[in-house]
Interface confidence: low
């Protein structure tokens, strides 16, 4: 039984030799005795190698200690060189002696680790490496040989040294080129070599550590988690992986580390560590960190694993139910949802599925590249959880707003000048969404505004006055807005009535809604003559003769000239409104006219003997004021109607009536020139009498106080120079003829 004092009072074991270093010759016997106050143990060099049969440890009595052990090694060899340690068995208190076994035939000791014969070095200027060629003789002259190429290193008392207990020390970069090294000692002209050491240059740089999947991972309880951690390093790197993960309730994590074949041509090494959990539970939720260490360098990467107890799907906040957009803009309707796993997203418009195309892209958000009015409607997004198949739907109404568009802006105004004293009507037809409640009218005197042709807004007025303030201008009345369905769109029509055209002015209609504003500026140029008339009819038909007459007071005007607005004058029509043609006469076609005079007026006539469709257009009559030399212009739009053979649209209905009633029938004929209509009864031409009335150019036939003999087949025939068209109707007269007094 071991008896002893508490550790506090223990003295180190006592050795039989007083020296710290003991030198003995090879082949002699080494014997050291150790005494102490507790159970003792001996430890000697290469103890783990099979040396026990040569080493004898025996109990020894005598002296004042009952704890005593003697170590004996007969016939020592150079390899027995090293530290001999006697220590207490259960307390870390010991005494050591270093023994050199001087063996001139084998001055280098082969240690246990030397069996590998490998020296690992790093290419680092500041690092030193130890080649463990320890010696059995302390004062040897040792050099280090490196090859290939052959190079010898000798201790320099500084960074290169040899110590019998350690080996040969030198900066590692000095031998990084070498494939192998060995130590060499000279004793009595005899050369002795240590074992060969292979030099392995070890890298340490870790370029990066990549986790896959890279971002937050979402799983449902029971699913498999696989995390791959890939490290890229420089060559000759040894790597250790460590995973830090939430403390799991069950030990079901599996980690597999392996080297990965790098891509050809890359000067990098790749390592992969895979963490697998076959069936995750809620307790596996948390942060997972992969740490890669090369000894000198550590790199890490982390990800968050979220474990849901079950699949779910729900919309997040901020999903709009109404989206408003302006025509032409890009519309984006994002879907905000919370889901595991990611949902299938389907979009529908007014109940019909939407597929992506070049104008519309569907997915996590609906994108309409350039929204049109046709895109307005109800859009429904349906999210489906692919595991639970739970569905959530949300509807978004898309309202497409249209800034006010004023229809007349696109047209050429048929008038540029207005006759003094006449009543005139100006109109703005506006389409907008949301529809307009108000269209504002403004005005300004013509001389208070400047005119810049070719600009998008050719008129510039410093300020506009509201039409209610018509002081100094024309008396105005704005009629109540009317709403009309034009080209399938609900439009607002605002009319400005000028009671008497007395002053030249500019009028502006302005419409504003939430999508924007629109305006139209109308030039209202008032002249006291000239006047234009069209003879013989206001709207002649092609191949008819037609004359344009421009009449001006001979005392006021001179230099009457006709012009036609042609294709080379299109710049006149550009921009916000019609350019005042008087300011741009050089751009017009001058026409030859015939001048007539009467007692008060000059009349300039342009005659078309055989009018064609090419003759229609805008004609300008220009006259110069004799006093002021100011030109006055008037525009007339000449419309030539195309020739058209007669046509009777629709059928004439058969009519049944009783004696004494009235029959009315209309012949719905059209054509150009206006057809001449003739009625026949039973193929006999019908003539007017007291009971038969023909009206509206024979278009309407009325038979009053019908008699039995008025029944029969009536035919309406419409004829012009291009031909005739006919339609028939049957009149049936019921009832008996009353006897007259004459009978």
């Amino acid at each position: 039984a071991s008896v002893g004092l508490p550790g506090d009072f223990l003295h180190p074991p006592k050795l039989s030799t007083q020296k710290d270093i003991l030198t003995i010759l090879a082949n002699t016997t080494l014997q050291i005795t150790c005494r102490g106050q507790r159970d003792l143990d001996w430890l000697w060099p290469n103890a783990q190698r099979d040396s026990e049969e040569r080493v004898l440890v025996t109990e020894c009595g005598g002296g004042d200690s009952i704890f005593c052990k003697t170590l004996t090694i007969p016939r020592v060899v150079g390899n027995d060189t090293g530290a001999y340690k006697c220590s207490y068995r259960d307390v870390d208190i010991a005494s050591t002696v270093y023994v050199y076994v001087r063996d001139y035939r084998s001055p280098f000791i082969a240690s246990v680790s030397d069996q590998h014969g490998i020296v690992y070095i790093t290419e680092n200027k500041n690092k030193t490496v130890v080649i463990p060629c320890r010696g059995s003789i302390s004062n040897l002259n040792v050099s280090l040989c490196a090859r290939y190429p052959e190079k010898r290193f000798v201790p320099d008392g500084n960074r290169i040294s040899w110590d019998s207990e350690i080996g040969f020390t030198l900066p590692s970069y000095m031998i990084s080129y070498a494939g192998m090294v060995f130590c060499e000692a000279k004793i009595n002209d005899e050369t002795y070599q240590s074992i060969m050491y292979i030099v392995v240059v070890v890298g340490y740089r870790i370029y990066d550590v990549i986790l896959s999947p890279p971002h937050e991972i979402e799983l449902s309880a029971g699913e498999k988690l696989v995390l791959n951690c890939t490290a890229r390093t420089e060559l000759n790197v040894g790597l250790d992986f460590t995973w830090h993960s939430p403390p799991s309730k069950s030990h079901h994590k599996k980690i597999v580390n392996r080297d990965v074949k790098p891509f050809p041509g890359t000067v990098a090494k790749m390592f992969l560590s895979t963490l697998t959990i076959e069936s995750v539970t809620k307790s596996d939720q948390g942060e997972y960190t992969c740490v890669a260490s090369s000894g000198r360098m550590i790199k890490r990467n982390r990800t968050f694993v979220r474990v849901h107890t079950k699949p779910f799907i729900a919309f997040g906040s901020g999903m709009k139910s109404l989206v408003e957009a302006t025509v032409g803009s890009q519309v984006r309707i994002p879907v905000k949802y919370l889901s595991y796993p990611a949902p299938d997203i389907k979009w529908y418009r007014n109940g019909r599925p939407i597929e992506s195309n070049y104008t519309m892209i569907v997915g996590d958000e609906l994108t309409i590249m350039e929204v049109t009015e046709r895109d307005a409607g109800n859009y429904t997004v349906i999210l489906t959880n692919p595991i639970s198949m739970e569905k959530q739907s949300h509807m978004v109404s898309l309202v497409v707003n249209v800034p006010p568009q004023i229809g007349e802006k696109a047209l050429i105004s048929p008038m540029d000048s207005y006759q003094y004293g006449t009543m005139q009507t100006l109109t703005c037809t506006v389409y907008a969404n949301p529809p307009l409640h108000h269209i504002q009218w403004y005005w300004q005197l013509e001389e208070a505004c400047s005119y810049r042709p070719g600009q998008t807004s050719p008129y510039a007025c410093k300020e506009w006055r509201h039409v209610e303030d018509f002081q100094g201008g024309n008396k105005i009345e704005v009629t109540k807005n009317q709403y009309a369905l034009i080209e399938g769109k609900n439009k607002t029509v605002s009319t400005l009535v000028i009671q008497a055209a007395n002053v030249s002015a500019l009028y502006k209609c302005e419409a504003i809604n939430k999508a924007g504003r629109g305006e139209r500026v109308i030039s209202f140029h008032v002249i006291r003559g000239p006047e234009i008339t069209v003879q013989p009819a206001a709207q002649p038909t092609e191949q008819e003769s037609v004359s344009l007459l421009c009449t001006a007071d001979r005392n006021t005007f001179e230099n009457l000239t006709w012009y036609k607005l042609g294709s080379q004058a299109t710049s006149v029509h550009m921009g916000e409104s019609l350019t005042p043609v008087c300011k741009n006469l050089d751009a017009l076609w001058k026409l030859n006219g015939t001048m007539f005079s009467n007692s008060t007026n000059d009349i300039l006539i342009v005659a078309f003997q055989n009018a064609s469709l090419q003759d229609q257009g805008d004609y300008v009559c220009s006259a110069q004021d004799k006093k002021t030399k100011k030109r006055h212009c008037l525009v007339k739009q000449l419309i030539i109607l195309e020739r058209m053979a007669p046509m009777i649209t629709g059928n004439l209905e058969n009519q049944t009536t009783t004696i004494g009633e009235t029959i009315e029938v209309t012949c719905p004929a059209s054509g150009n020139p206006t057809p001449h209509i003739t009625w026949f009864k039973d193929n006999e031409t019908l003539v007017e009498d007291s009971g038969i009335v023909l009206r509206d150019g024979n278009r309407n036939l009325t038979i009053r106080r019908v008699r039995k003999e008025d029944g029969g087949l009536y035919t309406c025939q419409a004829c012009n120079v291009l031909g005739c068209a006919r339609a028939e109707t049957l009149f049936i007269i019921e009832g008996a003829q009353e006897k007259t007094n004459l009978e």
Epitope: K282, S283, A314, G316
Partner: antibody
Framework: QSLEESGGRLVTPGTPLTLTCTVS????????MGWVRQAPGKGLEWIGF?????STYYASWAKGRFTISKTSTTVDLKITSPTTEDTATYFC????????????????WGPGTLVTVSS | AVVLTQTASPVSGAVGGTVTIKCQAS??????LAWYQQKPGQRPKLLIY???KLASGVPSRFSGSRSGTEFTLTISDLECADAATYYC?????????????FGGGTEVVVK
Amino acid sequence: QSLEESGGRLVTPGTPLTLTCTVSGIDLSSYAMGWVRQAPGKGLEWIGFISSSGSTYYASWAKGRFTISKTSTTVDLKITSPTTEDTATYFCANNYDDYGDFLHYFNIWGPGTLVTVSS
Amino acid sequence: AVVLTQTASPVSGAVGGTVTIKCQASQHIYSNLAWYQQKPGQRPKLLIYAASKLASGVPSRFSGSRSGTEFTLTISDLECADAATYYCQSYYYSSDSTDNTFGGGTEVVVK
């Protein structure tokens, strides 16, 4: 799984007060915790919550007035500068169902702790 | 922020009968609504979540439904133990805001 609030007492206006919710059987690194209060005779009022990752979210009226923090087993609610309007029973609550990390209805509630703010 | 408007208190029902409580949301909250029961001096108890899903351990006499932004809690086969105050709660989250509000509560009286 259970929750228990503590720290409720009578305080004077302006004196900071911290309430603690002690958690049993719930891993706070996996679940979010919320705080709800109820003034005497009044309805429930949501204050805020702390997510599993430690992010905090507050009702707009509670921002700056309350601070939520947590350790591995407790969740604290600090009333930074109490006023008499803060007199209420304070509940801590948890969504142990975990219907998504941020969809918080509460299926586990503590019994509540009463805070009285009076001068 | 979302405002939840509940049926005015009290709502009365006879034992064995049915009562319905309505909760109107001021904006779309989808199905993100829960119902709670609270008796005097006690902590609230979850009845319904996700507008219509029954919480575990809650009798099937309790049911929830949604129509747009209007939510309804129906208690059928009314029992004396159902006398309590019932609260609706909206809950949802997005990266930039959270809205997690309770309705004002509706007291149910059982005759």
